[in-house]
Interface confidence: low
């Protein structure tokens, strides 16, 4: 009498999350009579998939008909794949007795199961950062199988490179979850800028998934500070603006001080953008001359996006020959500036 | 003083192999987007090639497959691997820095002479 | 690619004077342009960028203006020292291209 075969063609089966798997089985004998039974997984903690004798297994059907005695296919098929389906099946050949003694099992056949990985969450950093410094921003996918994946960084199209990415966990599971944090250096002319996470798959058919974040929500610009004076008025009333140029975001506030004391406060609104995504802001204020016997120091302080106050100050001099001065004198154009205007 | 100053060019038979590298003085080379730009004799200026902060690489569509930028932070210098050369990249090579705010080109090193000819 | 095609192509024009460059994108590039001067055996210097704003060092009688797709350079009192050959660049997108150049030369 010929040894039984239980034979698995089949050593690996890949399926999409979702569709069915075919596992494959045929015996050589029919002899002796005992029922095939599946199991996912080997030794004493095996899980019963199907038993063709007998049992209610709602997921799974037999591929030809069991109860024919001349039947020597005992393959099966798993409806609605899930990555928790995912492992080694083995088929298991029985003789009939009491119990069931186990006779001969298949070689294996291990399922894998492709699950898209979920569409990339980007986020970037709590708070902004401004030009010239780093920011992270961190990319997640979730639920996908297998392991191997493909995760990209592009900033304005170009692929980045400071990028730290991790898969876990390291060994086998059902399914995977990666991260990926990429490292940003803001520019200034960054504010229309966009970062991509791209993320390749073999279920994606080379279609790959896309999260996206805008660097306008990670970069803050802050304002230059320009205070120039315009040429004395008949009236004797000086023209003094401040120029508030390139910042990002628009939440900006201006407070004119004449020596110290508040003038004015002016919250920025509705500002039309500039063609890098910054904004400009000017403010004037009018100063009479006449109406001071002292020197009028004046200051415009510009807070930002909640950072500190920067100021920029000079003093109109009150003079005995105020068609002397220049037409245009401007502050420098850092730090708390004072210019005398004559 | 900020200072670019480009060393490698000579005479290479076609086919040959040259590497050209640019060292940098008075700032901090990988804090720019740093370029290669060339000038056949006679001829215009031909951007070449370029390296971003992020290590992010471009080139030029002619020189791409034989041409590889790189830089080393530690020496504060940038490279050019320039192989499989031809005639027709005989040229001044010369190493310029992106500005930080635009990449608008602000500094350029002196050039460095290299000749492809048999 | 985009295209820079500078006019004229060489000009002839006297102490004093004043000369304007052309410069024209093949597509729009918003205001990333830049213009370069190159004398002979020199590397090219950089005098503007972003269309109109000047580097450091360079002297006011150089200006740039335009946006989009036409741009020009216009030295205000031609010195000996600035006849040479002038550059406009596009770097709004890879690969960065260069105008033909313009040979400014003494009349």
């Known amino acids: 009498e010929e040894e039984l075969q239980v034979i698995q063609p089949e050593k690996s089966v890949s399926v999409a999350a979702g569709d069915s798997a075919t596992l494959n089985c045929t015996v050589s004998s029919l002899i002796p009579v005992g029922p095939i039974q599946w199991f996912r997984g080997a030794g004493p903690g095996r899980e019963l998939i199907y038993n063709l004798k007998e049992g209610h297994f709602p997921r799974v059907t037999a591929v030809s008909d069991p109860t024919k005695r001349n039947n020597m296919d005992f393959s099966i098929r798993i409806s609605n794949i899930t990555p928790a389906d995912a492992g080694t099946y083995y088929c298991v050949k029985f003789r009939k007795g009491s119990p069931d003694v186990e006779l001969k099992s298949g070689a294996g056949t291990e399922l894998s199961v492709r699950a898209k990985p979920s569409a990339p969450v980007v986020s970037g950093p709590a708070v902004r950062a401004t030009a010239e410094h780093t920011v992270s921003f961190t990319c997640e996918s979730h639920g996908f199988s297998p392991r191997d994946i493909t995760l990209k960084w592009f900033k304005n199209g170009n692929e980045l490179s400071d990028v730290q990415t991790n898969v876990d966990p390291a060994g086998k599971s059902v399914s995977y979850s990666i991260r990926s944090t990429a490292r940003v250096l803001l520019t200034r002319r960054d504010v229309h800028s966009q970062v991509i996470c791209e993320v390749a798959h073999v279920t994606l058919q080379g279609d790959p998934l896309r999260g996206t974040a805008n660097l306008s929500e990670a970069i803050r610009v802050p304002p230059f500070l320009e205070v120039t004076q315009q040429s004395m008025r008949a009236d004797n009333q000086v023209n003094v603006t401040c120029q508030v140029t390139k910042f990002y975001p628009q939440r900006l506030q201006l407070t004119w001080l004449e020596n110290g004391n508040v003038s004015r406060t002016e919250m920025a609104s509705a500002l039309p953008e500039n063609k890098d995504g910054t904004y400009n802001w000017t403010s004037w204020l009018l100063v009479n001359v006449s109406a001071h016997r002292d020197d009028v120091k004046l200051t415009c302080q510009v807070e930002h996006d909640g950072q500190p106050a920067v100021n920029k100050s000079f003093s109109v001099k009150v003079s005995a020959h105020p068609k002397e001065q220049g037409s245009n004198t401007a502050a420098e154009n850092t730090g708390t500036n004072e210019r005398n205007i004559y | 003083e900020v200072q670019l100053v480009e060393s490698g060019g000579g005479l290479v038979q076609p086919g040959g192999s040259l590497r050209l590298s640019c060292a940098a003085s008075?700032?901090?080379?990988?804090?720019?987007?740093m370029h290669w730009v060339r000038q056949a004799p006679g001829k215009g200026l031909e951007w070449v090639s370029a390296?971003?902060?992020?290590?992010?690489?471009y080139y030029t569509g002619s020189v791409k497959g034989r041409f590889t930028i790189s830089r080393e932070n530690a020496k504060n210098s940038l490279y050019l691997q320039m192989n499989s050369l031809r005639a027709a990249d005989t040229a001044v090579y010369y190493c310029?820095?992106?500005?930080?705010?635009?990449?608008?080109?602000?500094?350029w090193g002196q050039g460095t002479m290299v000749t492809v000819s048999s | 690619d985009i295209q820079m095609t500078q006019s004229p192509s060489s000009l002839s024009a006297s102490v004093g004077d004043r000369v304007t460059i052309t410069c024209r994108a093949s597509?729009?590039?918003?205001?990333?342009a830049a213009w370069f001067q190159q004398k002979p055996g020199k590397a090219p210097k950089s005098l503007i960028y972003?269309?109109?704003s000047l580097h450091s060092g360079v002297p006011s009688k150089f200006s740039g203006s335009g946006s989009g797709t036409d741009f020009t350079l216009t030295i205000s009192s031609l010195q000996p020292e600035d006849f040479a050959t002038y550059y406009c660049?596009?770097?709004?997108?890879?690969?960065?291209?260069f105008g033909q150049g313009t040979k400014l030369e003494i009349k």
């Open positions: 310029v820095r992106g500005g930080v705010w635009d990449d608008a080109f602000d500094i």
């Open positions: 008075g700032f901090t080379l990988s804090s720019y987007d």
């Open positions: 390296i971003g902060t992020a290590g992010d690489t």
């Open positions: 597509q729009g590039i918003n205001n990333y």
């Open positions: 972003t269309a109109s």
């Open positions: 660049q596009q770097y709004v997108s890879y690969p960065y291209t």
